[in-house]
């Protein structure tokens, strides 16, 4: 009887089923929905988390100007296809054989088509802009304190290497966090910026994915930072391919 058997849960992903049947009675966890093995020492990929979310009961649930190629996730939730490593497959289809191409964070980057649609590669999202508006406070937050607190959050809570937090911008009440991570920069074991952004998004919405941890309590010099709106823009290494019809709509 080991400590692992007493607390066989996944600290970084509550949407798992765990059992102490690994070597020496160690805890082995699998994601809901996909049954895929999950590494509980790091963040779970967004694809597996979305798949788990879709399998769960429904009631369980100086500022930068985004470039013309920035994508916003307007399509909402869907049940994704994940590859054996837990990444999004480049082509996603629904039950009615409508298909589309996605980027590495699972956001649609082409018009929808049929089963003949080809998505040659999974295009990497290398730049994420998280745009937040905080609730009114007595005064503006100190920019350097805010910067330090958000960098600490991404480093400690989401285990994202500090070099991937490119900048924190602030013009009250808007905060922008820029995450950048090129394919060449991401080493084995590095948390993906897309996964970190997704965990952050869920935290901000009060839907923490962490097991047993309290919700996100963001404070800057003791002052609560309460977010009332979040917008996330995704920039891909290759610009998306939408028809002019969509762009002029």
């Amino acid at each position: 009887h080991t400590a692992a058997q007493d607390n066989c849960t996944c600290p970084t992903n509550k949407m798992t089923v765990c059992s102490p049947d690994g070597p020496g009675g160690r805890c082995q966890c699998r994601a809901l929905g996909s049954g895929m093995a999950v590494d509980c020492s790091t963040l779970t990929s967004k694809c597996l988390l979305l798949k788990a979310r879709m399998s769960a009961p429904k009631n369980a649930r100086t500022l930068v100007r985004p470039s013309e190629h920035a994508l916003v996730d307007n399509d909402g939730l869907y049940d994704p296809d994940c590859d054996p490593e837990g990444r999004f497959k480049a082509r996603q289809c629904n039950q009615t054989s409508v298909c589309w191409c996605v980027n590495s964070v699972g956001v649609r980057r082409t018009d929808k088509g049929d089963l003949s649609l080809r998505c040659d590669e999974l295009v990497r999202t290398h730049h994420i802009l998280i745009d937040l508006r905080h609730r009114p406070t007595a005064g503006a937050f100190n920019h350097s304190d805010l910067d330090a607190e958000l960098r600490r959050l991404f480093r400690e809570r989401y285990r994202l290497h500090p070099k991937f937090v490119a900048a924190v911008h602030y013009e009250q009440p808007t905060i922008q966090i820029e995450l950048r991570q090129n394919t060449s920069q991401k080493a084995a074991g590095d948390v993906d910026i897309g996964d970190a952004a997704y965990y952050f998004e869920r935290d901000i919405k009060g839907e923490s994915l962490f097991q047993g941890r309290g919700g996100l309590d963001l404070r800057v010099r003791g002052e609560p930072l309460q977010v009332e709106r979040t917008l996330i823009y995704y920039l891909d290494e290759i610009p998306p391919k939408f028809s002019m019809k969509r762009l002029t709509a």
């Epitope: 690994g22 070597p23 160690r26 966890c29 093995a37 999950v38 590494d39």
Partner: nanobody, 121 residues
Framework: QVQLQESGGGLVQPGGSLRLSCAAS????????MSWVRQAPGKGLEWVSY????????YYADTVKGRFTISRDNSKNTLYLQMNSLRAEDTAVYRC??????????????WGQGTMVTVSS
Amino acid sequence: QVQLQESGGGLVQPGGSLRLSCAASGFPFSSADMSWVRQAPGKGLEWVSYINAEGSKTYYADTVKGRFTISRDNSKNTLYLQMNSLRAEDTAVYRCARAKLTDTHYVEDYWGQGTMVTVSS
């Protein structure tokens, strides 16, 4: 990219023996913990045996303890599973996997396609 290729499976009579091999490439094998897992027809993946990177620490599932032996040759980037006293319930696809062990948790992150072992008279 990570590649794991198993071989050595086949049809064997109850009580017989087989030696499985797994050739690894695309990652530093000598610093990776490894495991054998199996999947019986219609069942989920079951962990069978584990060996650490140096080969100094091994673990076995209760169902195979005393009958199976895991080993590795880091100079050849190869993992082995010696299976003795085989039983009908050992029939499965055997896959080698790159593994990770902490004080409390265990996970596999890459698997080979597998080799079929059938134990039948």
